[in-house]
Amino acid sequence: ARPRTELLNVCMDAKHHKEKPSPEDGLHKQCSPWKKNSCCFANTSREAHKDISYLYRFNWNHCGSMTPACKKHFIQDTCLYECSPNLGPWIQEVNQSWRKERILHVPLCKEDCEQWWQDCRTSYTCKSNWHKGWNWTSGYNQCPEGAACHPFHFYFPTSAALCSEIWSHSYKVSNYSRGSGRCIQMWFDPAQGNPNEEVARFYARAMS
């Protein structure tokens, strides 16, 4: 874990992140809430909205076409991961070829998980952990042999399962609600400021 002094207003040492957060005026669509202070570049934010983008060559449509309502949560998840300067309390060192740091157990507000889970109920997948076990031979992820496509709820029976399992426990579902100052919001209205700054401060203090 990082020293106490490096928990606030920091960027992860990962594949596409800036070294330090700074304003980024041209952030695209769903990533635009982070434009006042961002760990992502404008081109990263544009790529976050594309299927099989150069960011990770990840194919959201690995079990047929993902619905737009579902896909927008994965775009938002990417924006949060790439752009947020408020994830410092949950950054961990990791020995991976493509990044030196990751996030672990970020407490996502329960409503953000509920909405994600509900909006993906009619989309399909073949795995519960999307970080590993894919067939990458085509240059993008495909379902491994023997992994059958089922509706999301088959692999993620609850909203908590979706948020915690999909990215190897990068997230966990918080018992707290949006606006409490105790959980990270994947979605927020930039006109009302970034609520995650307060959340990071709270957990940084708690960890010191």
């Epitope: 737009p68 927008k72 329960k110 409503e111 509920e114 609600s177 979605w187 006109a191």
Partner: nanobody, 132 residues
Framework: QVQLVESGGGSVQAGGSLRLSCAAS????????MGWFRQAPGKEREGVAG?????????????YYADSVKGRFTISQDNARNTVYLQMNSLKPEDTAMYYC????????????????????WGQGTQVTVSS
């Protein structure tokens, strides 16, 4: 001053459909969460469906439903008319209640859209009666 006016209620046989409308006027905010709630005699007010209007930064609107109405009810909006609709299909006798529309400038999603305490403006309600 915010005014919410519901319409479209009535009596229908089980299995039938109704479409409720909620017309909002005087709302000073562009981005609004709106919810449909219902209250049967002797029961607490419960959230049925909610919608957040959003914008570019949300990839469009967000909707959320109570488990009891999922797949039967659909909430939608007409921004030009400042109106939110609740299309109710496959109605059941247990859907009988007074239906209320509510609004708030908060960005609500998930179960937050179904929480009455999150809303600060309410309509007068429209009665829905489903007979078997």
């Amino acid at each position: 001053q915010v005014q919410l006016v519901e319409s479209g209620g009535g009596s229908v046989q089980a299995g039938g459909s109704l479409r409720l409308s909620c017309a909002a006027s005087g709302y000073p905010y562009h981005r609004v969460s709106m919810g449909w709630f219902r209250q049967a005699p002797g029961k607490e007010r419960e959230g049925v469906a909610g919608i957040y209007t959003g914008g570019l930064y949300t990839g469009g609107s967000m909707t959320y439903y109570a488990d009891s109405v999922k797949g039967r009810f659909t909430i939608s909006q007409d921004n030009a008319r400042n109106t939110v609709y609740l299309q109710m299909n496959s109605l059941k006798p247990e859907d009988t209640a007074m239906y209320y529309c509510a609004a708030t400038p908060q960005f609500l999603i998930g179960s937050g859209l179904l929480r009455p305490d999150k809303y600060n403006s309410w309509g007068q309600g429209t009665q829905v009666t489903v007979s078997s």
